[in-house]
């Protein structure tokens, strides 16, 4: 009941707590001398369901049969209305509508660790909407039953606080949970188990790894476990991998040898434990141990390439380039590269250790046969050396690949294609595709990129170090024994019209014609490979269309003659540059008047 109910009573039959779908009778009755003053026949009793009027009656009492109440709590209030006055609250009642508890399902119990306590969980089933008390019972040996009640509103978990011990690991325990409310009760099916069934060991701790003689092949993992653990499972993976290697071990006693670890790799290790072969459950995984395996001497061989540049009649510059070994080949931190240069006929050799670079440049005589060997060294040893005989890579014209083309292939990729050389194509042992940013003046400091291709391939997709709007000089070499032939082409992955035109820096007169000289467009403004330059000219102050001369682009060219100008006429001249995407804006304008005689 609610309120003080001094003026009357509200009674509910059969009960304040009813089953969903049931009918209740609500009676509101006034106490003696509590009706309307002087007008007892005018007593008007009104029944409210929450704030909604549902019934009224003149007299000392009111009966109302109510059906269809929803799950939960519904508040009924009875009020008295007298003439010329506000309604007076008489009394009220709450009615609780719910259902009997369903049978709790999936009861399961677990004890975390040998020193832990037994805790059980279950599924309550649908909400009863009533206060429901859950009692968990655990029957064990010696005819004893523990009992614990849960008074939480939504109870589906209880920890008994009882520690089962392994003195009799095969002893049976039976758990059962009973739900009780005003409308009924229901018990779960019993769950029977032994100590071994429900004890979930604590995860292993204090994990360590040892490498005997700093060798990855002699590696032992150590850990600590609870005393009764029989089984362990180990999982480990390189830190940058998502896939685990799994190992199951029995009676490991806190140690296991690992035989398949890769050198110089950071691994993550975790261990789980179990008390019995087929009973019980695995522990959670332990905290991760992260450890780096020791180095081993490098495997594999360096990919080495070179460039020759003529200096003068007696000397040539050799630039050697090599690619880093992959992590799996380096098997450690590469401390230095060892480069050996040898003159094959005279036997002279020089060796140098290179640190921090993957290239080396030296000057050698143009005479003699030269060879180089390059290897990579870590703390444990060196890779097998890669040996190359230095030759003129483009000397054999008949070995030159034919019809070389370079086309954009998606974002930052260039597809290079070619045809085999005319000379017996089967003589080709491999192709090398080389590319570098095109820099007027042929800067040798520009990084060199290359890839090797099988002799039966006639295309290669180059993507390493390819940037948009940059022009690359691409060479395809066909190698056969100690001979080589090459062809070259310019290519870009993405292009647009150049951002500016060439800057004319001088116009000079030579025998009735002029020579125009210009500065190259800065590389960052070329926006791809230049195809042509255009030189425009028109008479000063003329509105006529300018004349133009189109010159194919060549890297080294920065001057061109024009011989169609009239003497003693002042002309305005300017230049533009073109890529496949279009023409640049004008470069600077220059005026010039040819002094020579007219023809």
């Amino acid at each position: 009941k609610i309120d003080a109910c001094k003026r009357g009573d509200v009674t509910v039959k059969p009960s304040h707590v009813i089953l969903l779908g049931s009918t209740v009778n609500i009676t509101c009755s006034l106490k003696p001398r509590q009706g309307c003053f002087h007008y007892s026949r005018r007593n008007k009793l009104i029944l409210y369901k929450f704030d909604r009027r549902i019934n009224f009656h003149h007299g000392h009492s009111l009966n109302s049969q109510v059906t269809g109440l929803p799950l939960g709590t519904t508040l009924f209030v009875c009020k008295l209305a007298c003439i010329n006055s506000d309604e007076i609250q008489i009394c009220g009642a709450e009615i609780f509508v719910g259902v009997a508890p369903e049978q709790p399902q999936n009861l399961s119990c677990i004890q975390k660790g040998e020193q832990g306590t037994v805790a059980c969980t279950w599924e309550r089933g649908r909400d009863t909407h009533l206060y429901t008390e859950y009692t968990l019972q655990l029957s064990g040996p010696k005819n004893l039953t523990w009992q614990k009640q849960c008074k939480d509103i939504y109870c589906d978990y209880l920890d008994f606080g009882i520690n089962l011990t392994p003195e009799s690991p095969e002893s049976n325990f039976t758990a059962k949970v009973t739900a009780v409310n005003s409308l009924g009760s229901s018990s779960s099916l019993p769950s029977t188990f032994t100590f071994l069934d429900i004890v979930r060991p604590l995860p292993p701790w204090d994990i360590r790894i040892k490498f005997q003689k700093a060798s990855v092949s002699r590696c032992t993992l150590y850990w600590r476990d609870e005393g009764l653990v029989l089984l362990n499972r180990l999982r480990y993976r390189p830190s940058n991998s998502r896939l685990w290697n799994m190992v199951n071990v029995t009676k490991a006693k806190g140690r296991h040898d690992l035989l398949d670890l890769k050198p110089f790799t950071e691994y993550e290790f975790q261990i789980s434990s179990k008390l019995h072969l087929y009973k019980g459950s695995w522990s959670d995984w332990s905290e991760s141990l992260r450890a780096q395996t020791p180095e081993e001497e490098p495997t594999g061989m360096l990919d080495v390439w070179y460039m020759k540049r003529h200096i003068d009649y007696s000397r040539q510059q050799i630039s050697l380039f090599w690619k880093n070994l992959s992590v799996s080949e380096a098997r450690g931190k590469i401390l230095h590269y060892q480069v050996t240069l040898q003159e094959l006929t005279g036997g002279k050799a020089m060796t140098q250790n290179i640190t921090g670079h993957t290239s080396w440049t030296t000057v050698i005589p143009r005479t003699g046969n030269w060879a180089v060997a390059v290897s990579a060294a870590n703390s444990k040893g060196s890779s097998l050396p890669t040996r190359i005989n230095i030759m003129n890579l483009c000397e054999a014209g008949l070995l030159a690949p034919r019809q070389v083309s370079a086309n954009s292939e998606g974002m930052d990729n260039i597809l290079v294609t070619w045809q085999p050389p005319r000379k017996d194509p089967s003589a080709v042992q491999e192709y090398v595709v080389e590319w570098r940013e095109l820099h007027p003046g042929g800067d040798t400091q520009v990084p060199l990129n290359w890839l090797r291709s099988r002799p039966y391939n006639v295309s290669a997709l180059i993507s390493e170090n390819i940037k948009s709007y940059i022009c690359y000089e691409i060479r395809v070499y066909a190698l056969s024994g100690d001979q080589g032939g090459c062809s070259s082409i310019l290519g870009n992955s993405k292009h647009k019209a150049p951002l500016s035109g060439p800057h004319i820096n001088a116009i000079t007169e030579e025998k009735g014609s002029i020579l125009i000289s210009w500065n190259s467009i800065p590389v960052q403004e070329q926006m791809g490979c230049l195809l042509h330059y255009r030189i425009y000219w028109k008479e000063r102050d003329s509105n006529s269309q300018p004349q133009l001369c189109e010159i194919p682009y060549r890297v080294s060219q920065n001057s061109h003659p024009i011989n169609s100008l009239q003497p003693r006429v002042t002309y305005v001249l300017w230049m533009t540059a073109l890529t496949a995407a279009g023409e640049s804006s004008h470069g600077n304008e220059r005026e010039f008047c040819l002094q020579g005689k007219a023809n």
Partner: nanobody
Framework: QVQLQESGGGLVQPGGSLRLSCVES????????MGWFRQAPGKEREIVAA?????????YQDSVKGRFTISRDNDAKNTVYLQMNSLKPEDTAVYYC??????????????????WGQGTQVTVSS
């Protein structure tokens, strides 16, 4: 020093009821699990029921489950009760009150009871 004093024993007919009480005189009642043990003539002492210090967990001998109820009053009286209904002749014994710091959780371990009362006789006979 903890002292336990039982009361409420007596002679009762089969099917009758008794309520045993045990008062702890020290000031440490709320830290102890409390229990009732019994010993019939010529038999070993056995646990009947016990209740945890916080009153949340109880334990019963299977032969009394559903007939006996253990409860405790931590607030004022420092008392543990054993309500015994539907008594049978085989319930005849001396009933002892006991206190232990981990009585209810370590029933399978020896010597887990710290203090004993003097005992009260319960006889069920027609």
């Amino acid at each position: 020093q903890v002292q336990l004093q039982e009361s409420g024993g007596g002679l009762v007919q089969p099917g009758g009821s008794l309520r045993l009480s045990c008062v702890e005189s020290g000031r440490t009642f709320t830290v102890y699990d409390m229990g009732w043990f019994r010993q019939a003539p010529g038999k070993e002492r056995e646990i009947v029921a016990a209740i945890s210090a916080d009153g949340a967990t109880s334990i019963y001998q299977d032969s009394v489950k559903g007939r006996f109820t253990i409860s405790r009053d931590n607030d004022a009286k420092n008392t543990v009760y054993l309500q015994m209904n539907s008594l049978k002749p085989e319930d005849t014994a001396v009933y002892y009150c006991a206190a232990g710091r981990s009585l209810i959780y370590n029933l399978y371990r020896a010597n887990n009871t710290d203090y004993w009362g003097q005992g009260t006789q319960v006889t069920v006979s027609s």
